[in-house]
C-alpha cells in the first residue's frame, strides 16, 4: 500500500522536511503532489510525468519544493504555514490511480528558560511560594521537575497560567528540593537551571535515643537528643525539672537507682522562634535472677509420653522465651506453649526431641538465658540388623556375627540358633564351622526400660559347594535411550568372586556398563536395543564355581522411521496398489494409513485395486508403540498416470 512518511514529523522553522514515499508502484505514468487531504487542482504543488521527465508546478508551488524520481517531496526553509496534510496522487501506466496522504507540523525553536520566585525563605505551614517559568512562549508546553522527578500529585501543588506558574501552598520541609522548569514543543526542549527552595521549619518534638528506659545499676547513661529543624536547633537538658546543660548529648557514668527520674530535652529554633520539649522516664533496676528449667518427666518413652518443661522462677509482667537446639521454637503441632509462654509441652516425644532446651526471661534491659537441659528419651529397640550380610560360608572358616538395634537405653542382645538360646552378647562367634552349623540364626534385642523386644532371623548355609546363583533385575522392561537396568547376582556369599557374561562372552568395555557392590551388581545405563541379550552371572571361590541361568533383557524400543515398500512412486492407471509398511519396534507397533491426510485402515498393508489418477496424492504410514509411548510416520507421494502416457511407470501388483 502506498504510504507517505514525514521525516521528521515535527519540523523546526527554517529546517527542511522530506515527504518520503513508500511502496511506490512499478510502471508509473506520473505523480502529483497536493497541499491538503485530497486531490484538488487548485492546490496542486507539482506534477511529474515520467515518460517526458516533465515537472509542472501547480498553483500551490512556492519554489521551496523539490520532487525526486522516487516521488518523494523535499520542502526546504520550512515556514509555519507549511503545517498540515500533503497528498500524493500516483497514476500507474495503465491509468489506474493511487493516492496517499501524509502530514507534518511546524514549530519554532525554544530558548533556555529560567525560574523566578516570590519568596526565597518561606516558613513551613505558613507561607506559599510561587515559581514562574520565564519567558512566556507561544505554543510551548511547560513542565516542572522536583529533584529531577516529575511533579508529585498533591493538593498543595497547583499549576496555573498554562502550567507556567507552580504554586506551593503551605510549604513543608519536604518541599526543600531542587526545582527546574522545562519548555517543550515537538522540535525542541529546554530545561532551566535548578532553584533550591530553602524552607524554614521546626523544631519538631525532639526524639531521645536510645529508646530503652530501663537500665541496670552500674551502667553508663548516654542520652542523645535530636529535633528536625532548619536552621539546626539548639538543645538543653533538664533532670526532674532542673537544668543540666546546653548540649545535644547527656552523659552520666555508673548510674544508680537514684538516677531514676524524668529527663527532658528542649530544642529551640532561633529563626522561627519556636521551642519543643520531650520527656523520657528512666528507671534503674538491680540485677534480675537467672532462670532455670524444670521437667515433669525426666525419662519419657518415645511415642507414648508427653513432657512439660517449665521456666522458673515465676515473675509477674515478664516475657518468657524458648530455644531448641539454639534456634527459636519451630512450628509443630507437637509443641504447645502455655498462655504466659512459661511452660513448653512436647506431645508424644520422639528420639529427635532430646534438645538441648533453653528458656529465657526478658525484662526492660535484656534477656537472661537458663542453662541448657537435655531430654533423655527412651526408645527402641528398632529391628536389629545382623552383619555381615553373607548367607553362604565355606567349612573351616570362622563365623562372626554382630547384632545392632537402635535403643535408649542400649539394648541387651541374645542369640538363638534354630530356636535354641546360645548366649547373651551382642556378637556371636563360632570358630572352624562345618555343614552342621547351617541353620536359622536369630538375634533378639531387648530394652529393659521400655520392656520392648525385637528380633531378626538370618539363614546361614555352610557348604563347600557354592549354590547356583540367580539374577534379579530392577526393571524387567526398560525403554531404549531412557531407562537404566541393574542386575544383581544372588546370593551374597563370603570370600566369593562374582563374574558376568553377555551372550556367552565376557563383559565388553563400555562407558554404559558399570560393575559395583564387589562386582555383584551390573548396571546398564541408557539401554539400547542391542542390550537385549542373554546375561549370565557366575560365582566362584577357591573350591567351586557356579553359573546362573541366562536372563534375556527385553528392551522396549521404537517405532523407528517406517519404510514403505515397494519404493516405486509412479504407477499406471489400472494397476493394483499394494503398499507394505514396516518399522523396527518392540513390541510390534500398531500401523495406520492416511491418504491426503484422511485416515484409512489400521493395517500394515494398504491395498487398492485398479488405481486411477484420482488415487494421486500423499500416502502416510503412521506407527505407534503403546509400550514406549512413541510414534513415528513417513509420507510417500504416489503419481498415477493414464495408461500409456508416460514411459518407465510401474505396472503395479
Amino acid at each position: 500500500k502506498l504510504t507517505i512518511e514525514s521525516t521528521p514529523f515535527n519540523v523546526a522553522e527554517g529546517k527542511e522536511v522530506l515527504l518520503l514515499v513508500h511502496n511506490l508502484p512499478q510502471h508509473l505514468f506520473g505523480y502529483s503532489w497536493y497541499k491538503g487531504e485530497r486531490v484538488d487542482g487548485n492546490r496542486q504543488i507539482i506534477g511529474y510525468v515520467i515518460g517526458t521527465q516533465q515537472a509542472t508546478p501547480g498553483p500551490a508551488y512556492s519554489g521551496r519544493e523539490i520532487i525526486y524520481p522516487n516521488a518523494s517531496l523535499l520542502i526546504q526553509n520550512i515556514i509555519q504555514n507549511d503545517t498540515g496534510f500533503y497528498t500524493l496522487h500516483v497514476i500507474k501506466s495503465d491509468l489506474v490511480n493511487e493516492e496517499a496522504t501524509g502530514q507534518f507540523r511546524v514549530y519554532p525553536e525554544l530558548p533556555k528558560p529560567s525560574i523566578s520566585s516570590n519568596n526565597s525563605k518561606p516558613v513551613e505551614d505558613k507561607d506559599a511560594v510561587a515559581f514562574t517559568c520565564e519567558p512566556e512562549t507561544q505554543d510551548a508546553t511547560y513542565l516542572w521537575w522536583v529533584n529531577n522527578q516529575s511533579l508529585p500529585v498533591s493538593p498543595r501543588l497547583q499549576l496555573s497560567n498554562g502550567n507556567r506558574t507552580l504554586t506551593l501552598f503551605n510549604v513543608t520541609r519536604n518541599d526543600t528540593a531542587s526545582y527546574k522548569c522545562e519548555t517543550q514543543n515537538p522540535v525542541s526542549a529546554r530545561r532551566s537551571d535548578s532553584v533550591i527552595l530553602n524552607v524554614l521549619y521546626g523544631p519538631d518534638a525532639p526524639t531521645i535515643s536510645p529508646l530503652n528506659t530501663s537500665y541496670r545499676s552500674g551502667e553508663n547513661l548516654n542520652l542523645s537528643c535530636h529535633a528536625a529543624s532548619n536552621p539546626p536547633a539548639q538543645y538543653s537538658w533538664f533532670v526532674n525539672g532542673t537544668f543540666q546543660q546546653s548540649t545535644q548529648e547527656l552523659f552520666i557514668p555508673n548510674i544508680t537507682v537514684n538516677n531514676s527520674g524524668s529527663y527532658t530535652c528542649q530544642a529551640h529554633n532561633s529563626d522561627t522562634g519556636l521551642n519543643r520539649t520531650t520527656v523520657t522516664t528512666i528507671t534503674v533496676y538491680a540485677e534480675p535472677p537467672k532462670p532455670f528449667i524444670t521437667s515433669n518427666n525426666s525419662n519419657p518413652v518415645e511415642d507414648e509420653d508427653a513432657v512439660a518443661l517449665t521456666c522458673e522462677p515465676e515473675i509477674q509482667n515478664t516475657t518468657y522465651l524458648w530455644w531448641v537446639n539454639n534456634q527459636s521454637l519451630p512450628v509443630s503441632p507437637r509443641l504447645q506453649l502455655s498462655n504466659d509462654n512459661r511452660t513448653l509441652t512436647l506431645l508424644s516425644v520422639t528420639r529427635n526431641d532430646v534438645g538441648p532446651y533453653e528458656c529465657g526471661i526478658q525484662n526492660e534491659l535484656s534477656v537472661d538465658h537458663s542453662d541448657p537441659v537435655i531430654l533423655n528419651v527412651l526408645y527402641g529397640p528398632d529391628d536389629p540388623t545382623i552383619s555381615p550380610s553373607y548367607t553362604y560360608y565355606r567349612p573351616g572358616v570362622n563365623l562372626s556375627l554382630s547384632c545392632h538395634a537402635a535403643s535408649n537405653p542400649p539394648a541387651q542382645y541374645s542369640w538363638l540358633i534354630d530356636g535354641n538360646i546360645q548366649q547373651h552378647t551382642q556378637e556371636l562367634f563360632i570358630s572352624n564351622i562345618t555343614e552342621k552349623n547351617s541353620g536359622l540364626y536369630t538375634c533378639q534385642a531387648n530394652n529393659s526400660a521400655s520392656g520392648h523386644s525385637r528380633t531378626t532371623v538370618k539363614t546361614i548355609t555352610v557348604s563347600a559347594e557354592l549354590p547356583k546363583p540367580s539374577i534379579s533385575s530392577n526393571n524387567s522392561k526398560p525403554v531404549e535411550d531412557k531407562d537404566a537396568v541393574a542386575f544383581t547376582c544372588e546370593p551374597e556369599a563370603q570370600n566369593t568372586t562374582y563374574l558376568w557374561w553377555v551372550n556367552g562372552q565376557s563383559l565388553p568395555v563400555s562407558p554404559r556398563l558399570q560393575l559395583s557392590n564387589g562386582n555383584r551388581t551390573l548396571t546398564l545405563f541408557n539401554v539400547t536395543r542391542n542390550d537385549a541379550r542373554a546375561y549370565v552371572c557366575g560365582i566362584q571361590n577357591s573350591v567351586s564355581a557356579n553359573r546362573s541361568d541366562p536372563v534375556t533383557l527385553d528392551v522396549l524400543y521404537g517405532p523407528d522411521t517406517p519404510i514403505i515398500s515397494p519404493p516405486d512412486s509412479s504407477y499406471l492407471s489400472g494397476a493394483n496398489l499394494n503398499l507394505s509398511c514396516h518399522s523396527a519396534s518392540n513390541p510390534s507397533p500398531q500401523y495406520s494409513w492416511r491418504i491426503n491426510g484422511i485416515p484409512q485402515q489400521h493395517t500394515q498393508v494398504l491395498f487398492i485395486a485398479k488405481i486411477t489418477p484420482n488415487n494421486n496424492g500423499t500416502y502416510a504410514c503412521f506407527v505407534s508403540n503403546l509400550a514406549t509411548g512413541r510414534n513415528n510416520s513417513i509420507v510417500k507421494s504416489i503419481t498415477v498416470s493414464a495408461s500409456g502416457t508416460s514411459p518407465g511407470l510401474s505396472a503395479g501388483a
Epitope: 515518460g51 491509468l95 490511480n97
Partner: antibody, heavy 121, light 106 residues
C-alpha cells in the same frame, strides 16, 4: 491546434473484423496516452481501451477484452483499434481521444468526431 | 467494477437558472471524477477534471465539487448553449461513465 481524425468504420457482419485508425496532429503524439470511447445509438458513453505512450501499457473494458486490440505507430502519429469477433452490441460511434500531458487524474481533453461501426447480417 | 449513477436522468430548466447534477459512485473514488458535455451529433467536451478543477477555456459558471462517493456539477446561471447531455466519468479502473443527464429547455 490538436486534431484527431477517426477512419475505418462501416458495415460488417457478426463475427467479422474491422480496423479503426485515428490520425493525430497538433501535439507530441509519441508522449501522450491515447484511448477509444464508444457510444451506441441513443445510448451513453462507454470507455473501450487505452494505451501508453510507448505501447507498453494497454487496458481494456471487460466487454471487449480478448476481441479488440489497441495499438499505435508513433512514427505515423496514428492510433489503431483492431476489432475481431464483432457482435451486434458492438454497433456504435467510436471516438478516439487524448489524455493530456499531465493528466492528474486521468481525463480525456481532446476528442475526434467519431466513426460509425455497424455490425449486422 | 465501480458503478456510476447520475441523477436526474433528465432535467428541464430555463436560461438564468442554477442547475445541479449529481453523480454517485458505488465505492470511494477519492477526487478521481471528470465531467463532460455532449451536444447531439458532436464529440464530448471536457468540463471539469479531478472533481473540481475547471478545464482551460471552460466558462466559470461551471463548477464541480465532492469527493469519495458523492459529486456535483453546478451551472450557476444557465445559458442557451448549455442545453446538452452531461456525463460523469470516474478516473479509477476501468474509466466508466455515468448514464448521462439530459438538460432541456423548459
Amino acid at each position: 491546434e490538436v486534431q484527431l481524425l477517426e477512419s475505418g468504420g462501416g458495415l460488417v457482419q457478426p463475427g467479422g473484423s474491422l480496423r479503426l485508425s485515428c490520425a493525430a496532429s497538433g501535439f507530441t503524439f509519441s508522449s501522450s496516452y491515447m484511448g477509444w470511447v464508444r457510444q451506441a445509438p441513443g445510448k451513453g458513453l462507454e470507455w473501450v481501451s487505452s494505451i501508453g505512450s510507448g505501447s507498453y501499457s494497454t487496458s481494456y473494458a471487460d466487454s471487449v477484452k480478448g476481441r479488440f486490440t489497441i495499438s499505435r505507430d508513433n512514427s505515423k502519429n496514428t492510433l489503431y483499434l483492431q476489432m475481431n469477433s464483432l457482435r451486434a452490441e458492438d454497433t456504435a460511434v467510436y471516438y478516439c481521444a487524448r489524455y493530456p500531458p499531465v493528466p492528474f487524474p486521468p481525463h480525456l481533453d481532446y476528442w475526434g468526431q467519431g466513426t460509425l461501426v455497424t455490425v449486422s447480417s | 467494477d465501480i458503478q456510476m449513477t447520475q441523477s436526474p436522468s433528465s432535467l428541464s430548466a430555463s436560461v438564468g437558472d442554477r442547475v445541479t447534477i449529481t453523480c454517485r459512485a458505488s465505492q470511494s473514488i477519492s477526487s478521481y471524477l471528470n465531467w463532460y458535455q455532449q451536444k447531439p451529433g458532436k464529440a464530448p467536451k471536457l468540463l471539469i477534471y479531478a472533481a473540481s478543477s475547471l478545464q482551460s477555456g471552460v466558462p466559470s459558471r461551471f463548477s464541480g465539487s465532492g469527493s469519495g462517493t458523492d459529486f456535483t456539477l453546478t451551472i450557476s446561471s444557465l445559458q442557451p448553449e448549455d442545453f446538452a447531455t452531461y456525463y460523469c466519468q470516474q478516473a479509477g479502473n476501468p474509466h466508466t461513465f455515468g448514464q448521462g443527464t439530459k438538460l432541456e429547455i423548459k
